[in-house]
C-alpha cells in the first residue's frame, strides 16, 4: 500500500531529511516510478531508474552473483577457489551479514518496546491477534499448497533413482533425532528466557545422553544453551516491557522516547547498509553457487523436488498472498512488492528471515507507508513466527520422502504433516537451515523414514533461500494488511485508536487533508518553516 | 489375499547367472516396495536391498552392489533378482518380501523362498 | 550399520509357559522394531510390527514392548505351534538389519 507523499503548495512530494542530514526533494512523478509506476519518456525512464536505483542494483546483483558464480566454477584451473581462496571470495557478503546481524539485537527490542508502548492495550491485542491470525492462515495454506503440489507432481517417484547413487544406508546420522515434546517444549522455554544477556546470542535446545539405570540403557534429555539469539524470547521480552512501560504512564515516557530514539538511529544505520547491501548479496550468491560440487548432477536428480519448492513458493509469494492482499485491501499488491524488492533480494542473498528485518522495516516504512508503530511491532514478529515458506517447504518434502520410500499417506497423515508444518515452522525463528531440523519432527510424526533429510539438505541452500524469501514476504504483506485495517478503523472511529508516543519535540502540527496522506502518519512543520517533514518517514537513502 | 511366490530352487555352477522371480498377486503391485532378504545356511536374515516398484529403481545393501540385478515386469507384477558370475558363498536362500506402506522398513508379506545352491 | 543382538540365542519352554525374548539395538531405534516367526525350511512370518502391533491374523498370545535401545516379545501362553526361531528387525533406518534369531524348543 503506497502512502500519498505529504504535498507542498506547489505540488511537490515533501522534503525528507536524508540520512546524511540534508533534504531531498522528489517529484510526485518520481514517487510514481518509485512506487511501481510506469516509465514513458526519455525524461520519465531517467527519473524511474533514478527512484528505483537501489532497487535495480539489488535485482542485477543478484543476477550478477549467479553468473559470476556459474563464471568462476566453470573456469575451474587458475580460477579454482579451494576452502582458504573461497572464503575470501565471499568476504564482502560475509561482511553484509555481519552487518545486518548487527543491527537485529537493537533494533528488534528497541522497536518492539516502542511499537507495544506506543499502541493502546486493546489496539495491541487487536492488532496482535488479527497479525497472528493472518501468519497462521496463510502458513496452512502454504502447507497445503505444498501437499497438493507433491501429490501431483509426484517428485519422489521421479526422483527415487537418486536412492540408488545414495544407498541403502542413507545418513540417518545427519538426522536430528529429538522428541516431538521436546522441540514443542524447548519452544516455550525459549519464548521464556532465563537470562536475557544470553538470550541475545544463545538459545536452549534438549539434547539427549544415554545413561545406564538399572542395568538398562535409557536415554535420557538434557538441557543446554546452544549458539544462536533467542530471537523467540526477546521478542517476547521486548513487547512485554513494551506494555509495561505503557502502563507506568508519563514515567516510562522518557525511556520509551529513550528507545524510539534508539531506534531512529539504528533505522539511519540500515539506511547506510542497504547501500552496500548489493555489493554483499552479489558475493553471497556466487560464493554458494562456487561451492555446490556439482550443481548439475544435483539438478539432474533432484530437479522435480526443487522445481515443486520453488514453483510451490512461486505460487504462494505471487498469487496467493497478492490476492488474499487485494481482497482485502483493494489495492495492488504488485506494487506494494515492488516497494520491498531490496529486501526480497536481501532474503535471497542472506538466506535468514532475522538478517532482513532492518531492510524490509525500513522499505514497508518508506516505499509502502506502513506506520512506525505498525512495522516495527508487526515485522519483529513474522520474522520469528511466520514461516510460510519453511512449511510450504517442509510439506513438500515430507511428501517426496514418503514417495520416495514409498509410504503411503492416507489423510489423517496428510493432515498431521499440515498441522505439524505449521506449528514446528513457528519454532524455526528465522534461523538459516533451521526448517531441515524441524523436517525430522515431521517425518517423526507421520513414521517417515528419516534416512533422505541427507538428500534435502543437499538443494537446502537454494530451497532455504527461496523460503526466506517467501516468509519475509508474508511479514510485510502482513504488515501492510493491518496498516489497511487500522487505516479503516481509524476512518470510522472519532478518537483514534493507535497513539504515537514521539521521540521528536513538539512543533505545531501542520494541518494536512486526511485524504492526502495515511491517516497515521502525523505531520508538522519541518524546520525550514514551509516544507512540511512527515515525521514517520526517516531517511531518503 | 497377498501372496507372493517364487520360482523354484536352482542348483548353479560357479561363474552361471541366476534369475529368481517373484509374482505378487492379491494387491496393487505398484503401491508397495519389493524387497530381497538373504539366508544362507544355519545363518539369519540379511537385507539384500529392495526396488521401487512404482519408479522401477532398484536400491542395494552395501554388500550387494555389483553382482545383484533388481528388475521388475510391472505387467505380470513380478520382480526378479538376476544374480551373475556365481560364487560358492551365494548358496542361500533367497526371500521376496514386500515391504509396509508404513512405519518404515519391516516386510509384511514373504515369498516361500528360493533356495540357490551354487557347487562345482 | 545398526546392529541387533537377540537373546537368549536359543530357549527351552513348554506348553502354556509364558516366555519372554529380548532384543538390543546398538542405538535408539524409536520404537521401529518388528518380530518374524519362521519355522524351518518356510519363509519368515510378520508378528509383530513397529513395536507392539499386531500383524493381521497373529494371535493374541504374542505382545511386544520397549522403547529406544531394549525391546521384548512375549508369548502369553505357549501352543504347540509356537516352536519356531524368532527374528527381531530394525525398521529405523536403512539397511534394515536382523537379529540372529532366538530358536524357542519344546523342553
Known amino acids: 500500500m503506497v502512502a500519498d507523499p505529504p504535498r507542498d503548495s506547489k505540488g511537490l512530494a515533501a522534503a525528507e531529511p536524508t540520512a546524511n542530514g540534508g533534504l531531498a526533494l522528489a517529484s510526485i512523478e518520481d514517487q510514481g516510478a518509485a512506487a511501481g509506476g510506469y516509465c514513458g519518456s526519455r525524461d520519465q525512464v531517467r527519473r524511474c531508474l533514478r527512484a528505483n536505483l537501489l532497487v535495480l542494483l539489488t535485482v542485477v546483483a543478484v543476477v550478477a552473483g549467479v553468473a559470476l558464480g556459474l563464471g568462476v566454477s566453470g573456469a575451474g584451473g587458475a580460477l579454482a577457489l579451494g576452502p582458504e581462496r573461497l572464503s575470501a571470495f565471499v568476504f564482502p557478503g560475509e561482511l553484509l551479514l555481519r552487518l545486518l546481524r548487527m543491527i537485529i539485537l537493537p533494533l528488534v527490542v528497541c522497536s518492539l518496546i516502542g511499537g507495544a508502548a506506543s499502541l493502546d492495550p486493546g489496539a495491541l491485542g487487536r492488532l496482535g491477534a488479527w497479525a497472528l491470525l493472518f501468519f497462521l492462515v496463510t502458513t496452512l495454506l502454504a502447507s497445503a499448497l505444498g501437499v497438493g503440489l507433491a501429490l501431483a507432481l509426484q517428485p519422489g517417484a521421479a526422483s527415487a533413482a537418486i536412492n540408488a547413487s545414495v544407498g541403502a544406508a542413507g545418513s540417518a546420522e545427519n538426522a536430528p533425532s529429538k522428541e516431538v515434546l521436546d522441540s514443542f517444549l524447548d519452544l516455550a522455554r525459549n519464548i521464556f528466557p532465563s537470562n536475557l544477556v544470553s538470550a541475545a546470542f544463545r538459545s536452549y535446545s534438549t539434547t539427549y545422553e544415554e545413561r545406564n539405570i538399572t542395568g538398562t540403557r535409557v536415554k535420557v534429555p538434557v538441557g543446554q544453551e546452544v549458539e544462536g539469539m533467542n530471537i523467540l524470547g526477546l521478542v517476547v521480552f521486548a513487547i512485554v516491557f513494551g506494555v509495561a512501560l505503557r502502563k507506568l504512564g508519563p514515567e516510562g515516557e522518557l525511556l520509551i522516547r529513550f528507545f524510539n530514539s534508539f531506534n531512529e538511529a539504528t533505522m539511519v544505520l540500515v539506511s547506510w547498509i542497504m547501500w552496500y547491501a548489493p555489493v554483499g548479496i552479489m558475493f553471497l550468491v556466487a560464493g554458494k553457487i562456487v561451492e555446490m560440487e556439482d550443481v548439475g548432477l544435483l539438478f539432474a536428480r533432484l530437479g522435480k523436488y526443487i522445481l515443486c519448492c520453488l514453483l510451490g513458493h512461486a505460487i504462494h509469494g505471487l498469487l496467493v498472498l497478492p490476492l488474499i492482499y487485494f481482497l482485502f485491501t483493494r489495492k495492488n499488491p504488485y506494487r506494494f512488492l515492488w516497494g520491498i524488492v531490496t529486501p526480497l533480494a536481501t532474503a535471497f542473498g542472506t538466506s535468514s528471515s532475522s538478517a532482513t528485518l532492518p531492510l524490509m522495516m525500513k522499505c514497508v516504512e518508506e516505499n509502502n507507508g506502513v506506520a512506525k508503530h505498525i512495522s516495527r511491532f508487526i515485522l519483529p514478529i513474522g520474522a520469528t513466527v511466520n514461516m510460510d515458506g519453511a512449511a510450504l517447504f517442509q510439506c513438500v518434502a515430507a511428501v517426496f520422502i514418503a514417495q520416495l520410500s514409498q509410504q503411503s499417506l492416507d489423510f489423517v497423515k496428510i493432515i498431521t504433516i499440515l498441522v505439524t508444518a505449521t506449528a514446528s515452522s513457528v519454532g524455526a525463528a528465522g534461523i538459516p537451515a533451521g526448517g531441515v531440523l524441524t523436517l525430522a519432527i515431521i517425518l517423526e510424526a507421520v513414521n517417515l523414514p528419516v534416512d533422505h533429510i541427507s538428500l534435502i539438505l543437499a538443494v537446502d541452500w537454494l530451497v532455504d533461500r527461496s523460503c526466506t524469501v517467501l516468509n519475509v514476504e508474508g511479514d510485510a504483506l502482513g504488515a501492510g494488511l493491518l496498516q489497511n485495517y487500522v487505516d479503516r478503523t481509524e476512518s470510522r472511529s472519532t478518537e483514534p485508536e493507535l497513539i504515537q508516543v514521539k521521540s521528536e519535540l513538539p512543533l505545531d502540527p501542520l494541518p494536512v487533508p486526511t485524504e492526502e496522506g495515511n491517516p497515521l502518519l502525523k505531520h508538522y512543520r519541518g524546520p525550514a518553516g514551509d516544507a512540511t517533514v512527515a515525521s514517520e518517514k526517516e531517511s531518503v537513502m | 489375499q497377498v501372496q507372493l511366490v517364487q520360482s523354484g530352487s536352482e542348483l548353479k555352477k560357479p561363474g552361471a547367472p541366476v534369475k529368481v522371480s517373484c509374482k505378487a498377486s492379491?494387491?496393487?503391485?505398484?503401491?508397495?516396495?519389493m524387497s530381497w532378504v538373504r539366508q544362507a545356511p544355519g545363518q539369519g536374515l540379511k537385507w539384500m536391498g529392495w526396488?521401487?516398484?512404482?519408479?522401477?529403481?532398484?536400491i542395494y545393501g552395501d554388500d550387494f552392489k555389483g553382482r545383484f540385478v533388481f528388475s521388475l515386469d510391472t505387467s505380470v507384477s513380478t520382480a526378479y533378482l538376476q544374480i551373475s558370475s556365481l560364487k560358492a558363498e551365494d548358496t542361500a536362500v533367497y526371500f521376496c518380501?514386500?515391504?509396509?506402506?508404513?512405519?518404515?522398513?519391516?516386510?509384511?508379506?514373504w515369498g516361500q523362498g528360493t533356495t540357490v545352491t551354487v557347487s562345482s | 550399520d545398526i546392529q541387533m543382538t537377540q537373546s537368549p540365542s536359543s530357549l527351552s519352554a513348554s506348553l502354556g509357559d509364558r516366555v519372554t525374548i529380548t532384543c538390543r539395538a546398538s542405538?535408539?531405534?524409536?520404537?521401529?522394531l518388528n518380530w518374524y516367526q519362521q519355522k524351518p525350511g518356510k519363509a519368515p512370518k510378520l508378528l509383530i510390527y513397529?513395536?507392539?502391533r499386531l500383524h493381521s491374523g497373529v494371535p493374541s498370545r504374542f505382545s511386544g514392548s520397549g522403547s529406544g535401545t531394549d525391546y521384548t516379545l512375549t508369548i502369553s501362553s505357549l501352543q504347540p505351534e509356537d516352536f519356531a526361531t524368532y527374528f527381531c528387525q530394525q525398521g529405523h533406518t536403512l539397511p534394515p538389519t536382523f537379529g540372529q534369531g532366538t530358536k524357542l524348543e519344546i523342553k
Open positions: 518380501a514386500r515391504r509396509s506402506d508404513n512405519y518404515r522398513y519391516f516386510f509384511d508379506y
Open positions: 526396488i521401487h516398484t512404482y519408479a522401477g529403481v532398484p
Open positions: 542405538q535408539d531405534i524409536r520404537n521401529y
Open positions: 492379491g494387491y496393487t503391485f505398484s503401491t508397495f516396495g
Open positions: 513397529y513395536t507392539s
